[in-house]
């Protein structure tokens, strides 16, 4: 570490005095201090000498010397006071710029350490400091305003008490700059806009920032629009608002609008789309198939998407039959708005009953007229089966009736022994009826089919079973011939 001679931390001299500061080190040395006149600097090998034969108050300051080759970067310092009875302050800078919440050093150096007890910081023209100004003083460095705020951007003077009167320094202007976290915050409303040609429209682009220095503009397609801004300052933010008012829109006004704001940190932009239409519109659609099939007892939600401008004046769900004259309960109808011009309407049908199959229509109205979207709901049922013994054209015939939805398929089984249901081990014969006769097939109802099995002779120790199945399930009926006559019964549940 280099050494300064004289080897004292502080040196106090009078104006006009000769001052010599010698810095001695192992290698070459460099000195630095406040920029001031009348110093002569020369080197002789391992020492550096700073001298003046006419010290002034402007030589007041801290002088430091370093050894550039020293890897530890050691340095030595001495503080020189040139105590001028007429000049208690040496101001090193007249403008100080810091960011908010940084410490701001106002570099007014006291020229006489004895005056330290009577120093104070004031604003120019003797005005007191702003409330909550937290500061400290160092005779070597000056006044430090701690965690400076934007509002403390003022002109300051350092004051010292000399012979009972206050002597001021020249003024120091403090500029506290807002810390700008990024580009201005933006809003553009509405997010989407639809108007009929000739209607009025308004688009509002606004930007805000902690600093006043930012620009905002509204752009249509690639054209910057000339819109006067409305400016405001609240909640410690500057706000600039551009409002585009169109009294009568035309197709030329349609397109993409971008709100763009920029500052030193960069640029932000947000966009919206403006659609101009010739007349009112109302479009109904569904992502679901309009023909729905659901198993009885299950639930279903019917969903309709509505795109409309102007807004809906009325809407409702209606049951169009063919069963009861019941109408959907309002509490089961739900509406959600995706955005200004798109809505979703849902009808919840929980635990569907047979009487709830049929047509459900969603109707909506706006100035463009009425529109309807109709769903057809068919319920699926597992087959129900019954078998009877009869004679047709003199032949003994087993007649199997099966009803369900979708249309059931029919299979006949003949098996040994008396049983409610034939199992594989007992099966003697199997007949598939690929084309059973359809007895009834009305929309939204079960389909009833009939299958005939002609039996020349009923074997008494055997069982004849009619099985029907569809995509929902299966049903069966076992026919057991007994000597006293034919006996039929369905399988145990």
């Amino acid at each position: 570490i280099p050494v300064i001679e004289p080897s004292v931390p502080e040196l106090v001299v009078k104006p006009g005095a000769t001052v010599t500061l010698r810095c001695v080190g192992n290698g070459s040395v460099e000195g630095d201090g406040p920029p001031s006149p009348h110093w002569t600097l020369y080197s002789d090998g391992s020492s550096s000498i700073l001298s003046t034969n006419n010290a002034t108050f402007q030589n007041t300051g801290t002088y430091r010397c370093t050894e550039p080759g020293d890897p530890l970067g050691g340095s030595a310092a001495i503080h020189l006071y040139v105590k001028d009875p007429a000049r208690p302050w040496n101001v090193l800078a007249q403008e100080v710029v810091v960011f908010e919440d940084q410490d701001a050093l106002l570099p007014c150096l006291l020229t006489d350490p004895v005056l330290e007890a009577g120093v104070s910081l004031v604003r120019v023209r003797g005005r007191p400091l702003m409330r909550h100004t937290n500061y400290s003083f160092s005779p070597w460095h000056g006044f430090t305003i701690h965690r400076a705020k934007f509002i403390q951007s003022q002109d300051y003077q350092c004051s010292a008490l000399m012979g009972g009167r206050k002597v001021m320094s020249i003024s120091i202007r403090l500029k506290v700059q807002k810390v700008i976290p990024g580009p201005p915050a933006l809003t553009l409303v509405p997010a989407e806009l639809v108007r009929i040609r000739g209607e009025a429209a308004q688009i509002v682009c606004s930007a805000s920032s902690v600093d006043v220095n930012f620009d905002v503009f509204l752009q249509h397609n690639n054209t910057k629009l000339a819109i006067p801004q409305q400016s405001d300052f609240h909640n410690n933010r500057y706000q600039k608002v551009l409002t585009l008012n169109l009294d009568q829109v035309d197709f030329q006004h349609a397109g993409n609008y971008s709100c763009v704001a920029s500052n030193v940190q960069g640029k932000h932009s947000t966009s919206m789309f403006f659609r101009v239409v010739e007349s009112a519109y109302l479009n109904l659609s569904s992502e679901q198939n309009l023909i729905q099939e659901v198993t009885v007892g299950e639930g279903l939600n019917l969903k309709v998407m509505v795109e409309a401008y102007p807004g809906l004046q009325g809407f409702n769900w209606t049951y169009l039959g063919p069963f009861s004259d019941h109408q959907p309960e309002p509490k089961l109808a739900n509406a959600t708005t995706k955005d200004t011009y798109r809505h979703t309407f849902t009808l919840s049908l929980p635990r569907l009953k047979p009487s709830e199959a049929g047509r459900y229509s969603f109707l909506a109205r706006n100035p463009g007229g009425w529109r309807a979207l109709t769903f057809e709901l068919t319920l699926r049922y597992p087959p129900e089966v019954s078998v009877i013994w009869t004679f047709i054209n003199g032949s003994g015939t087993l007649l199997c009736a099966a009803s369900g939805y979708p249309q059931p398929n029919v299979t006949w089984l003949q098996c040994s022994g008396h049983t409610d249901r034939c199992d594989e081990a007992q099966v003697l014969q199997v007949w598939d009826d690929p084309y059973p006769e359809v007895l009834s097939q009305e929309p939204f109802h079960k389909v009833t089919v009939q299958s005939l099995l002609t039996v020349e002779t009923l074997e008494h120790n055997q069982t004849y079973e009619c099985r029907a199945h569809n995509s929902v399930g299966s049903g069966s009926w076992a026919f057991i011939p007994i000597s006293a006559g034919a006996h039929t019964h369905p399988p145990d549940e």
Partner: antibody
Framework: EVQLQQSGPELEKPGASVKISCKAS????????MNWVKQSNGKSLEWIGN????????TYNQKFKGKATLTVDKSSSTAYMQLKSLTSEDSAVYYC????????????????WGAGTTVTVSS | DIQMTQSSSYLSVSLGGRVTITCKAS??????LAWYQQKPGNAPRLLIS???SLETGVPSRFSGSGSGKDYTLSITSLQTEDVVTYYC?????????FGSGTKLEIK
């Protein structure tokens, strides 16, 4: 030469409406916003509002909303201001004035002015 | 709305002399200020925009200064034709507002 030529003086009865015109020449009419300014007998100036001749966008001083309606006819490079439900308070000289800067939103000083139209409202 | 105050409605001036017209905004206007000159029976004429920028064709004896809320229009070597009314106008925020005007009169 850039000029704004305003229509002649108007004498109207209270409750009536009046439509005054401002014909632009010597520059691209749709490129500059047109502003309207009111000056009541030798008093100060009041900004009424502006219209963008290309887009038709308008901005009104809230004080004149409902009183003044600004329109343009691009084919004849003419801006119009209609004043309705006239009262003696509306007696003034009305100026049309071109916005000074060509693009962007920043500069709304007025570099070219019409000679003014005097509107007198008297029964 | 931002109020623009021209504290002197009338100022007595000497030909050949210097005059300073002041304009104070009720809020910070970021130098977005224009000065106009109006002669009797005429429309206003733009002299200065951006608080300091002289318009083309305006004599250099006119100058503008100021920042924040306080602005001034200075005229040096005052000529007879300058003894008219001057208005300031802020265009920082809508509605744009004008000062009440300062009329110069020869002493």
């Amino acid at each position: 030469e850039v000029q704004l030529q305003q229509s002649g003086p108007e004498l109207e009865k209270p409750g009536a409406s009046v439509k005054i015109s401002c014909k632009a020449s010597g520059y691209s009419f749709t490129g500059y916003n047109m502003n309207w300014v009111k000056q009541s007998n030798g008093k100060s100036l009041e900004w009424i509002g502006n219209i963008d001749p290309y887009y038709g966008g308008t901005t009104y001083n809230q004080k004149f909303k409902g009183k003044a309606t600004l329109t343009v006819d691009k084919s004849s490079s003419t801006a119009y201001m209609q004043l309705k439900s006239l009262t003696s308070e509306d007696s003034a000289v009305y100026y049309c004035a071109r916005r000074g800067d060509y693009s962007g939103s920043s500069y709304w000083y007025f570099d070219v002015w019409g000679a003014g139209t005097t509107v007198t409202v008297s029964s | 709305d931002i109020q623009m105050t021209q504290s002197s409605s009338y100022l007595s001036v000497s030909l050949g002399g210097r005059v300073t017209i002041t304009c104070k905004a009720s809020d910070h206007i970021n130098n977005w200020l224009a000065w106009y000159q109006q002669k009797p029976g005429n429309a206003p004429r733009l002299l200065i925009s951006g608080a300091t920028s002289l318009e083309t064709g305006v004599p250099s004896r006119f100058s503008g200064s100021g920042s924040g809320k306080d602005y001034t229009l200075s005229i040096t070597s005052l000529q007879t034709e300058d003894v008219v009314t001057y208005y300031c106008q802020q265009y920082w925020s809508t509605p744009f507002t004008f000062g009440s005007g300062t009329k110069l009169e020869i002493k």
